[in-house]
């Protein structure tokens, strides 16, 4: 009888089924929806999380201007195809044979087409801009305190290496967090910025993915930081390919 058998859950992903039938009675966890093995010592990939979510019962300006190539996830939820390592497959299709290409965070980056659509490679999202608006407070937060607290959050809660948090901008009431991670910078074992951003997004919405942890309680010098709006922009290493019709719509 081992400690694993007493508490066979996945600390980093509550959307799992776990059983103490691994070697030596160790806890082995698989993602809902896909049945894929999950490493509970780190964040689960966004693709597996989305798949699990779809399988669950339905329930002087310092601010950055997103580039013209920045993508926003306007398509909402879908049931994605994930590769054997849990990453998004470059081409996604729905039940009616409508297909499109996605980037590494699963956001559509082409017009929709049919089954003949080709997506040659999974294009990496190397820059993520998280744009937040906080609820009114007595005064503005101290920028350096806010910066330190958000960096600590990404380091400790999401296990994202500090070098990938490029900047924290603040112009009350808007906060912007810039995450940057090129293919060449991401070493084996590094948390992906797309996964960290997704966990953060779910935390901000009060839908924490962590097992048994309380919701996100963000405080800056004891003052609660309550977010009332979130927008996330995704920039890919190769610009997206949309028709002019969409761009002028």
């Amino acid at each position: 009888h081992t400690a694993a058998q007493d508490n066979c859950t996945c600390p980093t992903n509550k959307m799992t089924v776990c059983s103490p039938d691994g070697p030596g009675g160790r806890c082995q966890c698989r993602a809902l929806g896909s049945g894929m093995a999950v490493d509970c010592s780190t964040l689960t990939s966004k693709c597996l999380l989305l798949k699990a979510r779809m399988s669950a019962p339905k329930n002087a300006r310092t601010l950055v201007r997103p580039s013209e190539h920045a993508l926003v996830d306007n398509d909402g939820l879908y049931d994605p195809d994930c590769d054997p390592e849990g990453r998004f497959k470059a081409r996604q299709c729905n039940q009616t044979s409508v297909c499109w290409c996605v980037n590494s965070v699963g956001v559509r980056r082409t017009d929709k087409g049919d089954l003949s659509l080709r997506c040659d490679e999974l294009v990496r999202t190397h820059h993520i801009l998280i744009d937040l608006r906080h609820r009114p407070t007595a005064g503005a937060f101290n920028h350096s305190d806010l910066d330190a607290e958000l960096r600590r959050l990404f380091r400790e809660r999401y296990r994202l290496h500090p070098k990938f948090v490029a900047a924290v901008h603040y112009e009350q009431p808007t906060i912007q967090i810039e995450l940057r991670q090129n293919t060449s910078q991401k070493a084996a074992g590094d948390v992906d910025i797309g996964d960290a951003a997704y966990y953060f997004e779910r935390d901000i919405k009060g839908e924490s993915l962590f097992q048994g942890r309380g919701g996100l309680d963000l405080r800056v010098r004891g003052e609660p930081l309550q977010v009332e709006r979130t927008l996330i922009y995704y920039l890919d290493e190769i610009p997206p390919k949309f028709s002019m019709k969409r761009l002028t719509a």
């Epitope: 694993a4 691994g22 070697p23 160790r26 806890c27 082995q28 966890c29 093995a37 490493d39 509970c40």
Partner: nanobody, 121 residues
Framework: QVQLQESGGGLVQPGGSLRLSCAAS????????MSWVRQAPGKGLEWVSY????????YYPDTVKGRFTISRDNSKNTLYLQMNSLRAEDTAVYRC??????????????WGQGTMVTVSS
């Protein structure tokens, strides 16, 4: 990138033996824990043996204990599974996998394509 290539599968009679091999590349094999897993038709993956990086620790589920033996040759970047006293219920695709074992959890993160083992008279 990580590559795992299995060989040695085939058709064998009940009570017979087979030795599977797995050639590994694209990662430091000698510092990686490894496992053999199998997938019977219409079933999920189940692990059938585990070996730590230096080969000093092995684990087996009760279903194969005493019949299967996992071993490795780090100088050849190769993992082995010796299967004796085979039964019809051992019929499955066998895949080698890179594994990770902590005090509380076990996970596989890369798998080979697999080699088919059929036990039938």
């Amino acid at each position: 990138q990580v590559q795992l290539q299995e060989s040695g599968g085939g058709l064998v009679q009940p009570g017979g033996s087979l030795r599977l091999s797995c050639a590994a590349s694209g990662f430091p094999f000698s510092s990686a824990d490894m496992s053999w897993v199998r997938q019977a038709p219409g079933k999920g993956l189940e692990w059938v043996s585990y070996i730590n990086a230096d080969g000093s620790k092995t684990y087996y589920p009760d279903t194969v204990k005493g019949r299967f033996t996992i071993s490795r040759d780090n100088s050849k970047n190769t993992l082995y599974l010796q299967m004796n006293s085979l039964r019809a219920e051992d019929t499955a695709v066998y895949r080698c996998a890179r594994a990770k074992l902590t005090d509380t959890h076990y996970v596989e993160d890369y798998w080979g394509q697999g080699t088919m083992v059929t036990v039938s008279s």
